[in-house]
Interface confidence: medium
Amino acid sequence: LNTTILTPNGNEDTTADFFLTTMPTDSLSVSTLPLPEVQCFVFNVEYMNCTWNSSSEPQPTNLTLHYWYKNSDNDKVQKCSHYLFSEEITSGCQLQKKEIHLYQTFVVQLQDPREPRRQATQMLKLQNLVIPWAPENLTLHKLSESQLELNWNNRFLNHCLEHLVQYRTDWDHSWTEQSVDYRHKFSLPSVDGQKRYTFRVRSRFNPLCGSAQHWSEWSHPIHWGSNTSKENPFLFALEA
């Protein structure tokens, strides 16, 4: 048997490659219609949702999903055990933590049970599809008269994440942003004590453990300055 491992060419393209776009659907039988593309995201390596656009089908169809891992100990075909529904039609599958193997090629197959030959297979690198939870517990420490340090926590292995910090004052029209590596701390060397600052952070599973493109949600914002600075000049963790 061939033991090669399939690897996608870069990150998954999210364009609808599995929809027919070149000719009207009424000129083809259902059995030749391409199936919708499956998109999978691994949420904080706690569970994974694989979803598809069920409304792309010419008539309501409960498509079925099977999955396995290519060339591994987990290459036995598995049926989805927890379907997600949209208007009573299957539109996704949720896999639990024990079913997620980040560093093996994940193979997902969508099938029309009425037309068994109508099936499409996709291969995904799950380590590129991880979306961490938003950073938590933002705190600000005043390191000196004009220097602030922002710290936060993530509910995941810290060394696997990179971060994006955004901050602005009440006088600013746009955010200033700064990339931060796995150390999850950020220093602002020059702070104007007359202004009120707002900070927020998001995180991404990149580059040490994977090459994910999607960021987490933004953290709750934290504020510093003017109306708060007199209360405790050394520690602030005020959320909006």
């Epitope: 399939l6 996608p8 060419n9 998954e12 393209d13 364009t15 490659d17 599995f18 027919l20 776009t21 070149t22 000719m23 083809l28 030749t32 219609l33 391409p34 199936l35 593309e37 290519k70 109508r118 099936q119 499409a120 297979t121 996709q122 291969m123």
Partner: nanobody
Framework: EVQLVESGGGLVQAGDSTTISCVAS????????FGWFRQAPGKEREFVAT????????YYSDSVEGRFTISKDNAKSTVYLQMNSLQPEDTAVYYC????????????????WGQGTLVTVSS
């Protein structure tokens, strides 16, 4: 029903590059996903690469990843396999295959096949 004709095979020196082509006729080219498979003498047919209907998603076996590139020209109804840094182990008959529903690495999932083109890599 789509017909597939491969071309471009031949004798190549190790380390060199070549491109093989697959012209499709008799079907709506843009509605098909395509795959390249190969079969070396005395071995089973093995997956090489696959490309989706619109050409935006492609996959490779780990033995050719980084050396081979699959592409698709809908205007010319042609699929290409560009092969760089060829090695003697790449010697095989290369087959083009088409299917309706999306990329797949299993030969049994493909509906239509070409006759193959022989690529020989000499050391």
């Amino acid at each position: 029903e789509v017909q597939l004709v491969e071309s471009g095979g031949g004798l190549v020196q190790a380390g060199d590059s070549t491109t093989i082509s697959c012209v499709a006729s008799g079907g709506s080219f843009a509605t098909y996903a395509f795959g390249w498979f190969r079969q070396a003498p005395g071995k089973e047919r093995e997956f090489v690469a696959t490309i989706s209907q619109r050409g935006s998603t492609s996959y490779y076996s780990d033995s050719v990843e980084g050396r081979f590139t699959i592409s698709k020209d809908n205007a010319k109804s042609t699929v290409y396999l560009q092969m760089n840094s060829l090695q003697p182990e790449d010697t095989a008959v290369y087959y083009c295959a088409a299917r309706y529903y999306g990329v797949d690495y299993r030969s049994t999932s493909y509906d239509f096949w070409g006759q193959g083109t022989l690529v020989t890599v000499s050391s």
